[in-house]
């Protein structure tokens, strides 16, 4: 399955939107910094079957969508930018969804990389617990916004490697 060029553009637009969403300086939130232990190894490996890699990317975007779809999120961010973010993420999910399904039917059901999916889920669990702990403060959301940008940057690299494999 070839990810459409629009997927790359959508990814870039998502990064831009996340940057635009910034409401306060990260420097004023230094005391709230946190290591969420991004599972970098799940994005570095060349050991991935293509279907597995696409599933991992899908999980990152799906969890990001869910994170920013909460009531607490709608209070924290500019509604207009949030709506644009939802649209971008939704489109990317659709692109990846079609690819996952195509990979499934081309080669029978490939083995789901369970540990990679779980690693991504745990990473977002750490983010969720951090926000809860910090009572969804503006600084906590700013730290999370910056972290999600970092994770999208890493997933972009995985997408580029996928494209080179095609």
């Amino acid at each position: 399955c070839d990810l459409p060029q629009t997927h790359s553009l959508g990814h870039r637009r998502t990064m831009m939107l996340l940057a635009q969403m910034r409401r306060i300086s990260l420097f004023s939130c230094l005391k709230d910094r946190h290591d969420f232990r991004f599972p970098q190894e799940e994005f570095d490996g060349n050991q991935f079957q293509k279907a597995e890699a696409i599933s991992v990317l899908h999980e990152v975007i799906q969890q990001t969508f869910n994170l920013f779809s909460t009531k607490d999120s709608s209070v924290a961010w500019d509604e207009r930018l949030l709506d644009k973010l939802y649209t971008e993420l939704y489109q990317q999910l659709n692109d990846l969804e079609a690819c996952v399904m195509q990979e499934v039917w081309v080669g029978g059901t490939p083995l789901m990389n369970e540990d990679s999916i779980l690693a991504v889920r745990k990473y977002f669990q750490r983010i969720t617990l951090y926000l809860t702990e910090k009572k969804y403060s503006p600084c906590a959301w700013e730290v999370v916004r910056a972290e999600i940008m970092r994770s999208f940057s890493s997933s972009r690299n995985l997408q580029e490697r996928l494209r080179r494999k095609e």
Epitope: S55, N66, L93, V104, M112, K122, F124, L129, T132
Partner: antibody
Framework: QVQLVQSGAEVKKPGASVKVSCKAS????????MHWVRQAPGQGLEWMGE????????IYNENFKSRVTMTRDTSTSTVYMELSSLRSEDTAVYYC????????????WGQGTLVTVSS | EIVLTQSPATLSLSPGERATLSCSAG???????LYWYQQKPGQAPRLLIY???NLASGIPARFSGSGSGTDFTLTISSLEPEDFAVYYC?????????FGQGTKLEIK
């Protein structure tokens, strides 16, 4: 509000298959993995596996891998769990439970479907 | 597979008393992925505590959770009549996800 409504009780003969449904409402169906958990009479809970309704990929408990199939129908926001080669030990209440994170993990359950396997 | 062993299997106490339920894991479980559920006869399980020590929405403050590594505890500070039920610990730290066999809390 989030609701998971399961299909009714079933009685099956050993060797047959059963297909239990779980209809979701009150949230975006494709955004959350759906899990299946079973409970034999007077026993504890046993996780069977999960399905991502968005693309249909599944992760199964090895104990059920050869006999279980989880599918979904996005047009009706319904997930299905089919268990084949039934034996008497499969007599249990089967629950669907929605995934999520933090306080949302297994925060929503179906009402349960009793499957009785008897000759 | 991470085996969760709950003790005691049955706990007989009176309303107003303090209940301490244990959950022991066969191998280490990150506290973020250890949950507790309550189940009453004929009902689906209900989330009580998430990530070892956080109260789920609508759960009274008499419930609390603690622990780390392989030993986790659910405490009910002063039992109310509606607390008599079966309690399960659950982990999703690694596949396959598992539950303890349950502790039945009954009225003495």
């Amino acid at each position: 509000q989030v609701q998971l409504v399961q299909s009714g009780a079933e009685v099956k003969k050993p060797g047959a298959s059963v297909k239990v449904s779980c209809k979701a409402s009150g949230y975006t169906f494709t955004n959350y993995w759906m899990h299946w958990v079973r409970q034999a009479p007077g026993q504890g809970l046993e996780w069977m596996g999960e399905i991502n309704p968005s693309h249909g990929r599944t992760i199964y408990n090895e104990n059920f891998k050869s006999r279980v199939t989880m599918t979904r129908d996005t047009s009706t926001s319904t997930v299905y769990m089919e268990l084949s080669s039934l034996r008497s030990e499969d007599t249990a209440v089967y629950y669907c439970a929605r995934g999520g994170l933090g306080p949302a993990w297994f925060a929503y359950w179906g009402q349960g479907t009793l499957v009785t396997v008897s000759s | 597979e991470i085996v969760l062993t709950q003790s005691p299997a049955t706990l007989s106490l009176s309303p107003g008393e303090r209940a301490t339920l244990s959950c022991s894991a066969g191998s280490s479980v990150d506290s973020s992925y250890l949950y507790w559920y309550q189940q009453k006869p004929g009902q689906a399980p209900r989330l009580l505590i998430y990530s070892t020590s956080n109260l789920a929405s609508g759960i009274p403050a008499r419930f609390s959770g603690s622990g780390s590594g392989t030993d986790f505890t659910l405490t009910i500070s002063s039992l109310e009549p509606e607390d008599f039920a079966v309690y399960y610990c659950h982990q999703w730290s690694s596949y396959p996800f598992t539950f303890g066999q349950g502790t039945k809390l009954e009225i003495k």
